[in-house]
């Protein structure tokens, strides 16, 4: 009998709302085993896999996507979705990226922290494994 | 399918140096982390390093064995992973398998394996 | 670093009888434990991950079970393609640590 799957989250670092140029990562969360993890924009066909995947606590397991630089091509919705063999999951909540200009520059401290969407919310870092984030992707169409 | 061969194994003296590579296929090379995984005449398997992808700065782990002398690298350009051994010890001799991982941290693909001997 | 305990480190076993090799961490793994068979001559080959799930291609009559700090691999049946030295290895934490080994003899 397959199990059923957990939704996974989705949360952004630093936040949701982020300076033109600045970076973000978004961090998928799903329960041990998973294979892959996939970010996905409004279009499922626009995503980026990755199979760096971290051990985040007893009971999960994340991955990482980060945008170097972001530019207004970046801003909208994103989700998480994972295969965890033999299936799919289902799909994370949206969670929306905002770009906005700023006369700070790349550092100024005007990011909205810790935002997230998704039924799990936990610190995204087990220091005990050493395992810290998680990876790049395959594209359909380029992400980032 | 996927492939992982490994190359530029040999005969070394005690403190001396070689770099191991591992050339990838089948597979997308760039969105899984590496490892390169040993094992000893008549001996078991021993874990040497890892190496993260891009979105995690190429992350580095090493057993402490290996510490300060092994470099782990790799070129997403050219699907290669490379292992720089320096100051080698006659006890880092044997097979060197180049890995890639699944789940985080379970070794699912494994290559033929490369023989590094250090002996004066 | 996390020690992982093969208690045997060889077994002399009848074909069909079923086997059944432990292996016990150190501390808690939260069932990051894999299992991997390696024939002789040959490279090592993932069986199981996640202390339960068997990879793709793995015959139904190897299973995993244990949580915490103690895990099994079973065979129900042994088959002569079976003889191998049995490793199992914990990924919950850098440095990964694998066991010493059981290798299964015919007797």
């Known amino acids: 009998q397959e199990e059923d799957l957990p939704r996974p989250s989705i949360s952004a670092e630093p936040g949701t709302v982020i300076p033109l140029g600045s970076h973000v990562t978004f961090v998928c969360r799903g329960p041990v085993g998973v294979q892959t993890f996939r970010l996905e924009r409004e279009s499922r066909s626009t995503y980026n896999d990755t199979e760096d995947v971290s051990q985040a606590s007893p009971s999960e397991s994340e991955a990482r996507f980060r945008i170097d630089s972001v530019s207004e091509g970046n801003a909208g919705p994103y989700r998480c979705i994972y295969y965890k063999p033999p299936k799919w999951s289902e799909q994370s909540d949206y969670l929306e990226l905002l770009v906005k200009e700023t006369s700070g520059g790349p550092d100024s401290p005007d990011t909205e922290p810790g935002s997230s969407a998704g039924p799990t919310q936990r610190p995204s870092d087990n220091s005990h494994n050493e395992h810290a984030p998680a990876s790049q992707g395959l594209k359909a169409e380029h992400l980032y | 399918e996927v492939q992982l061969v490994e190359t530029g194994g040999g005969l070394v003296q005690p403190k001396g140096s070689l770099k191991l590579s591992c050339a990838a296929s089948?597979?997308?090379?760039?969105?899984?982390?590496m490892n390169w995984v040993r094992q000893a005449p008549g001996k078991g398997l021993e874990w040497v390093a890892r190496i993260r992808t891009k979105n995690n700065n190429y992350a580095t782990y090493y057993a402490d064995s290996v510490k300060d002398r092994f470099t782990i690298s790799r070129d997403d350009s050219e699907s290669m992973l490379y292992l720089q051994m320096n100051n080698l010890k006659t006890e880092d001799t044997a097979m060197y398998y180049c890995?890639?991982?699944?789940?985080?941290?379970?070794?699912?693909?494994w290559g033929q394996g490369t023989s590094v001997t250090v002996s004066s | 670093d996390i020690q992982m305990t093969q208690s045997s480190s060889s077994f002399s076993v009848s074909l069909g009888d079923r086997v059944t090799i432990t292996c016990k961490a150190s501390?808690?793994?939260?069932?990051?434990l894999a299992w991997y068979q390696q024939k002789p001559g040959n490279v090592p080959r993932l069986l199981i991950s996640?202390?339960?799930s068997l990879e793709t291609g793995v015959p139904s009559r190897f299973s995993g079970s244990g949580s915490g700090k103690d895990y099994t691999l079973s065979l129900t049946s042994l088959q002569s393609e079976d003889v191998a030295t049995y490793y199992c290895?914990?990924?919950?934490?850098?440095?990964?640590?694998f066991g010493g080994g059981t290798k299964l003899e015919i007797k």
């Open positions: 501390e808690d793994i939260y069932n990051r």
């Open positions: 890995v890639r991982d699944r789940y985080g941290g379970a070794m699912a693909y």
């Open positions: 290895q914990q990924y919950w934490t850098i440095p990964y640590t």
């Open positions: 089948g597979f997308t090379f760039n969105i899984n982390a």
């Open positions: 996640s202390a339960t």
